[in-house]
C-alpha cells in the first residue's frame, strides 16, 4: 500500500500557502485528485510528488495515491481544505445525473472543516428542499439525496454561515432519470379496420415512455410511412403519435400496418388489418345448430353473430309462430360487440313454457340490405299416459294413449295383485310394443301415440299397466279390472271408476 | 452593457390576460436566473417570479401562483411572463431583473412596463 | 404586511449624512441572509446600490455604505447631494415565506 506524506489524513492551508504531497510505493505511483489549476507533478520512480505554491478553494479535495501494479489495489488518500474565508465551497460539478432511487451526491466540497455545523442544503436562491427529501453531508464529498425521486430534479445550493452570514455555492442541477423498464408502451387504433372503397380512414399509431428518447414509426406492408409526429407530455409520460389519414381509400390502401416503437430498453410492436371492399356487407350466421330442442320449463339463448359494414341501422328478434302472435321480450335481448364489424346478439328464452315453441327469426339491417337468421325450437316433454278398456271387433282391448316428446316408446306389463306400479317381483308378462300407432305428429306439439294391447279375459286379481318413455323420462298408467267393472289407477292418484 | 427592455403591458379588464415580454442584451442570458418584479402605482417593490437559466426551476410569489406563468426562450435572449384571469389588484408596472445566485439580490433592472387591470 | 421595515421617509441638508434602517427577524436578516439595497430615482427603475450588506457595485460613489448586525441593517450616506433624492428599498430573503422580500421604501428629501 502507499504511503501518503504529510502521513495525516486531511490538511488545512490558506489561500496563496504552498502545498507539497509525496506519495511512495513499491512501484511506480499515481495521483488522482480534482480537476483544479495550479498543480505540477513530479514522478522518480516509485515516488511521486504533486506541489502548488499557490493554493486556492480549487484545490479543495480528497487527494488519491494508487499502485497501478498492486494485484490488492491498495490506495492511500489525504483530503486538502484550502480555507478561502469569502469561499467555503468548492463545487466539483454543476449537474449531477443519475436514475431514480440512487443517491445523488452533490458535489459541494466544504473549503473550511470549521463550518461544517452550518452548513445546510437549498433549492435555488434558498428555498426550502421538497418535503421527504432525505439527505446527509460529508465535508469531503457534499451532500447526499438519499434514493432521489423524478420530482427531485432540481437546482440546488449549499449553504454556510460564515460569521454569521449565509454563503452560497454556485448552483448545482441535479437531473433524476425515470428507469425505463422497457420498451415504450403502444397502441394502434383501429385494432382492425375496414372501409368501402372510396371512403376516408384514419389509423393512429401512439407511443409512450417515461423517458423522451425513443423513436415511432408506422408502416404498411413493410414499407416505412412518412407522417408527421405530434409530441406531448402528461402523466409524467412522453408521447409520440403518427397519423395516417387517408381521403379516398383504393384497394392498394388494404393490408397489415405496423406500430413500430423503440429505445435503448429495445422495441415494442402491434399490428393491425385493414380491408378494403367494393360494396356494404352483412353476414349472420350462428355456432348453434338452427334446429333446437329442449326440454319443457328450461331455459335456451339463441345466439347470433353478425359481421357487418357499415353498421348496423336496425336489429329484431321475431316469433314467427304456430302458437301465439307474443313477441321475445326487448328485456331478454341482448347485444355484445366482439370488435368494431363483429357483434353477438342473444335472445335469452327462461323456463320455457308449451307455447313458446316455434321458429324464431333475427333480422338484421345494414346498407347492403336485409339478412335474416332463423331458428327452430322444438320443446321435450315426459310422456303423459292414459289407459282406457274397450271393444274393438268384439274383441276386450286396453287401448293406452301416450303423449310426449320425442315419441314416447310402449311397453304393457301384466302382473299380480292390485298395485298402482308393477315392481319386478310381482310382473307375470311384458309385451314391448316397437310400432305404436300415431295418432298426431305435427311440427313444434307432442307426437301422441296409440298402443292396443288384446286380452281375452281379464284376470281380476291382476293389474295391467301401460308405461311409455322417452329421452325426457317416462310415464305409466295402471288398470286394474274388478268384478263390477274395470277400474283405472294413473300414477299417484286414486280408483276412479270411469 | 447589460440591457433589459419590457414590453406588453398595457390595459385589460379584469379576468383577461396579456404578455410581458424582456428582451435581454450585454451579458449571456442563458447564464443566468432571471426575475420579475412588480411595484403598484404609489406603492413599493414586490417580488413576482422566478427562473432558473434553463428553465428547471421555477417559482412564484403566492399572490400570483396558478395565473401566472413564466418562462424563457434562451435562444431569442427574452424572458416572459403570461398573465392571466388578471383582478385589479395585479395593476403595477412590471419589471424584469437579472439575479444573482450568490446573494439573492438582483444586479440589473429593465425600466418597466405598466399594466392596468381596469373595467 | 411588509416583512422588512423601514422609516417613510428621511431628510438631510446638502453635505450632511443621514442613516436608512431596515428591521427584519430571525427569519430573514436575523438568519443570516444578505440585505440589499436599491435605489430609485424619481420615474426610473431600481437600481442596485449596495449588495450582500455593505458591497458597493462599480459605479456607486463610496459616499453610499451599508452595514447589518443582528435583525437589523442600515444604509448610510454622506456628502448627501441633491441628485441623492429618491427612494430607497432594502431587500433580503425570507425563510418563512420561502420568498425574496422588500422593505415599504424610505424617501430621502435633500432640503
Known amino acids: 500500500i502507499p504511503v501518503i506524506e504529510p502521513s495525516v489524513p486531511e490538511l488545512v492551508v490558506k489561500p496563496g500557502a504552498t502545498v507539497t504531497l509525496r506519495c511512495v510505493g513499491n512501484g511506480s505511483v499515481e495521483w488522482d485528485g480534482p480537476p483544479s489549476p495550479h498543480w505540477t507533478l513530479y514522478s522518480d520512480g516509485s515516488s511521486s510528488i504533486l506541489s502548488t505554491n499557490n493554493a486556492t478553494f480549487q484545490n479543495t479535495g480528497t487527494y488519491r495515491c494508487t499502485e497501478p501494479g498492486d494485484p490488492l489495489g491498495g490506495s492511500a488518500a489525504i483530503h486538502l481544505y484550502v480555507k478561502d474565508p469569502a469561499r467555503p465551497w468548492n463545487v466539483l460539478a454543476q449537474e449531477v445525473v443519475v436514475f431514480e432511487d440512487q443517491d445523488a451526491l452533490l458535489p459541494c466540497l466544504l473549503t473550511d472543516p470549521v463550518l461544517e455545523a452550518g452548513v445546510s442544503l437549498v433549492r435555488v436562491r434558498g428555498r426550502p428542499l421538497m418535503r421527504h427529501t432525505n439527505y446527509s453531508f460529508s465535508p469531503w464529498h457534499g451532500f447526499t439525496i438519499h434514493r432521489a425521486k423524478f420530482i427531485q430534479s432540481q437546482d440546488y445550493q449549499c449553504s454556510a454561515l460564515m460569521g454569521g452570514r449565509k454563503v452560497m455555492s454556485i448552483s448545482i442541477r441535479l437531473k433524476v432519470q425515470k428507469v425505463i423498464p422497457g420498451p415504450p408502451a403502444l397502441t394502434l387504433v383501429p385494432a382492425e379496420l375496414v372501409r368501402i372503397r372510396g371512403e376516408a380512414a384514419q389509423i393512429v399509431c401512439s407511443a409512450s415512455s417515461v423517458d423522451v428518447n425513443f423513436d415511432v414509426f408506422l408502416q404498411h406492408n413493410n414499407t416505412k410511412l412518412a407522417i408527421p409526429q405530434q409530441s406531448d407530455f402528461h402523466n409524467n409520460r412522453y408521447q409520440k403519435v403518427l397519423t395516417l389519414n387517408l381521403d379516398q381509400v383504393d384497394f392498394q390502401h388494404a393490408g397489415n400496418y405496423s406500430c413500430v416503437a423503440s429505445n435503448v430498453q429495445g422495441k415494442h410492436s402491434t399490428s393491425m388489418f385493414f380491408r378494403v371492399v367494393e360494396s356494404a356487407y352483412l353476414n349472420l350466421s350462428s355456432e348453434q345448430n338452427l334446429i333446437q330442442e329442449v326440454t319443457v320449463g328450461e331455459g335456451l339463448n339463441l345466439k347470433v353473430m353478425v359481421e357487418a359494414y357499415p353498421g348496423l341501422q336496425g336489429f329484431n328478434w321475431t316469433y314467427l309462430g304456430p302458437f301465439s302472435d307474443h313477441q321475445p321480450e326487448p328485456k331478454l335481448a341482448n347485444a355484445t360487440t366482439k370488435d368494431t364489424y363483429r357483434h353477438t346478439f342473444t335472445l335469452s328464452l327462461p323456463r320455457l313454457k308449451p307455447s313458446e315453441a316455434g321458429r324464431y327469426s333475427f333480422l338484421a339491417r345494414n346498407p347492403g340490405g336485409w339478412r335474416a337468421l332463423t331458428f327452430e325450437l322444438t320443446l321435450r316433454y315426459p310422456p303423459e299416459v292414459s289407459v282406457i278398456w274397450t271393444f274393438i271387433n268384439g274383441s276386450g282391448t286396453l287401448l293406452c294413449a301416450a303423449s310426449g316428446y320425442p315419441q314416447p316408446n310402449v311397453t304393457w306389463l301384466q302382473c299380480s295383485g292390485h298395485t298402482d306400479r308393477c315392481d319386478e317381483a310381482q310382473v307375470l308378462q311384458v309385451w314391448d310394443d316397437p310400432y305404436p300407432e300415431v295418432l298426431s305428429q305435427e311440427p313444434f306439439h307432442k307426437v301422441t301415440v296409440q298402443s292396443l294391447l288384446t286380452v281375452e279375459t281379464l284376470e281380476h286379481n291382476q293389474t295391467y299397466e301401460c308405461r311409455a318413455h322417452n329421452s325426457v323420462g317416462s310415464g305409466s298408467w295402471a288398470f286394474i279390472p274388478i268384478s263390477a267393472g274395470a277400474h283405472t289407477h294413473p300414477p299417484d292418484e286414486f280408483l276412479f271408476t270411469p | 452593457e447589460v440591457q433589459l427592455v419590457e414590453s406588453g403591458g398595457g390595459l385589460v379588464q379584469p379576468g383577461g390576460s396579456l404578455r410581458l415580454s424582456c428582451a435581454a442584451s450585454?451579458?449571456?442570458?442563458?447564464?443566468?436566473?432571471m426575475n420579475w418584479i412588480r411595484q403598484a402605482p404609489g406603492k413599493g417593490l414586490e417580488w413576482v417570479s422566478y427562473?432558473?437559466?434553463?428553465?428547471?426551476?421555477?417559482y412564484y410569489a403566492d399572490a400570483v401562483k396558478g395565473r401566472f406563468t413564466i418562462s424563457r426562450d434562451n435562444a431569442r435572449n427574452s424572458l416572459y411572463l403570461q398573465m392571466n384571469s388578471l383582478r385589479a389588484e395585479d395593476t403595477a408596472v412590471y419589471y424584469c431583473?437579472?439575479?444573482?445566485?450568490?446573494?439573492?439580490?438582483?444586479?440589473?433592472w429593465g425600466q418597466g412596463t405598466l399594466v392596468t387591470v381596469s373595467s | 404586511q411588509l416583512v422588512l421595515t423601514q422609516p417613510p421617509s428621511v431628510s438631510g441638508a446638502p453635505g450632511q449624512r443621514v442613516t436608512i434602517s431596515c428591521t427584519g427577524s430571525?427569519?430573514?436578516?436575523?438568519?443570516?441572509?444578505?440585505v440589499h439595497w436599491y435605489q430609485q430615482l424619481p420615474g426610473t427603475a431600481p437600481k442596485l446600490l449596495i449588495y450582500?450588506?455593505?458591497n458597493r457595485p462599480s459605479g456607486v460613489p463610496d459616499r453610499f455604505s451599508g452595514s447589518k448586525s443582528g435583525t437589523s441593517a442600515s444604509l448610510a450616506i454622506t456628502g448627501l447631494q441633491a441628485e441623492d433624492e429618491a427612494d430607497y428599498y432594502c431587500?433580503?430573503?425570507?425563510?418563512?415565506?420561502?420568498?425574496?422580500?422588500f422593505g415599504g421604501g424610505t424617501k430621502l428629501t435633500v432640503l
Open positions: 431583473a437579472r439575479g444573482v445566485e450568490s446573494d439573492f439580490s438582483f444586479d440589473y
Open positions: 450585454g451579458f449571456t442570458f442563458s447564464n443566468d436566473e
Open positions: 427562473i432558473s437559466s434553463r428553465s428547471s426551476t421555477i
Open positions: 430571525s427569519s430573514n436578516i436575523g438568519a443570516g441572509y444578505d
Open positions: 450582500g450588506n455593505s
Open positions: 431587500q433580503s430573503y425570507d425563510s418563512s415565506l420561502s420568498e425574496e422580500v
